[in-house]
């Protein structure tokens, strides 16, 4: 029968900075029911705030919404786990959405084959930035990677698109079955996840670039 | 009212094993566990260990993590505790204490453990 | 383990007066801290935990203070009821150990 441990807030993620969740790790555990509760302030206030919506991020999470979400505003917040032999903190943690934004992944990736008469052929792509981000306000510029393999392939070889949504790439062995992935970023934060693995057949007529 | 309840006193020679249980009630035992604290003759106060009711946790001291065993009993909210290989050294009363609404709120009256040959 | 200190091991005081008991930690406790009174041949009985908190039905003449490693239980008006051993405990990890007790007698 021990107080609860100390719980560890490790990470807060915003999909667009228009809402953002934060989970954390507990403690050790001390044998009995322990609560969690998440309480924050803003930098510059005093008064402190319970989590808004504790079930949305699933378990051990904290999920603000956009009435909960404020642009260049620094978030204090800390977790306190609670037992019957007591109650132990989280060291605090200083959260500004700017700077935890991690995008959904690109969508609608499509990738082609393409075999010009009079130049050398090549793999072309093309792909949306998420749906929740919004580049029309300026609030964003979005970064994009490529990775493509061989199918049986180990190793990935990657391409920075920059803020481009299509990329071409020339050096491809004949005959193959590629998988590609695309991936996003925003200038300040964090890659998504990759999207999910488009495949395209090589043809066998495929003239590598020399 | 929270009451726990111990077994009577016993007396056992060297060598031979115990098991003392203590009897809850007045509170949700399921949210708790028991913790047995052991007081020689004249001497201080000594943690044993604990059994978890809530998840089945147990953690003993050291000293007596190889021949002490605690559970507890959801269905006749009670918990034991059973130590083997007795000596005249752990002649004491034994105490059993639980946590209800805060640390050690609630003891029981104590057991007499006597070992002599 | 953390090693608990209890100063003194013993102490006389008259009825009506102040007393106060220190505990040392060994390390850090994070406050987790509890009093603990014992009359001969009765279970003990608890007082403060949490360092400071007074535990249900306990007259408020038992005060518990300090922090870190340093804690202390003062009681302010000595009653005869009072005079008995009292143990210090940290619950902060395992294993939960005790003071040596203190025991107060009547002057």
């Known amino acids: 029968q021990l107080p609860p441990g100390k719980p560890e807030i490790f990470k807060c993620r915003s999909p667009n900075k228009e809402t953002f969740t934060c989970w954390w790790r507990p403690g050790t555990d001390g044998g009995l029911p322990t609560n969690y509760s998440l309480t924050y302030h803003r930098e510059g206030e005093t008064l402190m705030h319970e989590c808004p919506d504790y079930i949305t991020g699933g378990p051990n999470s904290c999920h603000f919404g956009k009435q909960y979400t404020s642009m260049w505003r620094t978030y204090v917040m800390m977790v306190n786990a609670t037992n019957q032999m007591g109650s132990s903190f989280s060291d605090e943690l200083y959260v500004d959405v700017t700077y935890i934004v991690q995008p959904d992944p690109p969508l609608e990736l499509t990738v082609e084959v393409k075999q010009p008469e009079d130049r050398k052929p090549y793999l072309w792509m093309k792909w949306s930035p998420p749906t929740l981000i919004d580049l029309k306000t300026g609030w964003f510029t979005l970064l994009y990677e490529i990775r493509l393999k061989p199918e049986k392939a180990a190793e990935w070889e990657t391409h920075f698109a920059g803020q481009q949504t299509e990329f071409k790439i020339l050096s491809l062995h004949p005959g193959q079955k590629y998988l590609v992935q695309v991936r996003c970023k925003p200038d300040h934060g964090y890659w998504s996840a990759w999207s999910p693995a488009t495949f395209i057949q090589i043809p066998s007529d495929f003239i590598m670039n020399d | 009212q929270v009451q726990l309840v111990q077994s009577g006193a016993e007396v056992k020679k060297p060598g031979a094993s115990v098991k003392v249980s203590c009897k809850a009630s007045?509170?949700?035992?399921?949210?708790?566990?028991i913790t047995w604290v052991r007081q020689a003759p004249g001497q201080g106060l000594e943690w044993m260990g604990w059994?978890?009711?809530?998840?089945?946790?147990?953690d003993y001291a050291q000293k007596f993590q190889d021949r002490v065993t605690m559970t507890t009993d959801t269905s006749t909210t009670t918990g034991y505790m059973e130590m083997r290989s007795l000596t005249s050294d752990d002649t004491a009363v034994y105490y059993c204490?639980?946590?209800?609404?805060?640390?050690?709120?609630?003891w029981g009256q104590g057991t007499l453990v006597t070992v002599s040959s | 383990d953390i090693q608990m200190t209890q100063s003194p091991s013993s102490l006389s005081a008259s009825v009506g007066d102040r007393v106060t008991i220190t505990c040392r930690a060994s390390?850090?406790?994070?406050?987790?801290l509890a009093w603990f009174q014992q009359k001969p041949g009765k279970a003990p009985k608890s007082l403060i935990y949490?360092?400071?908190s007074l535990q249900s039905g306990v007259p408020s003449k038992f005060s518990g203070g300090g922090s870190g490693t340093d804690f202390a239980l003062t009681i302010s008006s000595l009653q005869p009821e009072d005079f008995a051993t009292y143990y210090c405990?940290?619950?902060?990890?395992?294993?939960?150990?005790f003071g040596q007790g203190t025991r107060l007698e009547i002057k």
């Open positions: 204490t639980t946590v209800v609404r805060r640390p050690f709120d609630f």
């Open positions: 405990q940290q619950y902060s990890s395992y294993p939960i150990t």
């Open positions: 390390q850090d406790i994070n406050n987790f």
């Open positions: 059994s978890s009711a809530y998840n089945g946790k147990t």
């Open positions: 007045g509170y949700t035992f399921g949210t708790s566990g």
């Open positions: 949490a360092a400071s």
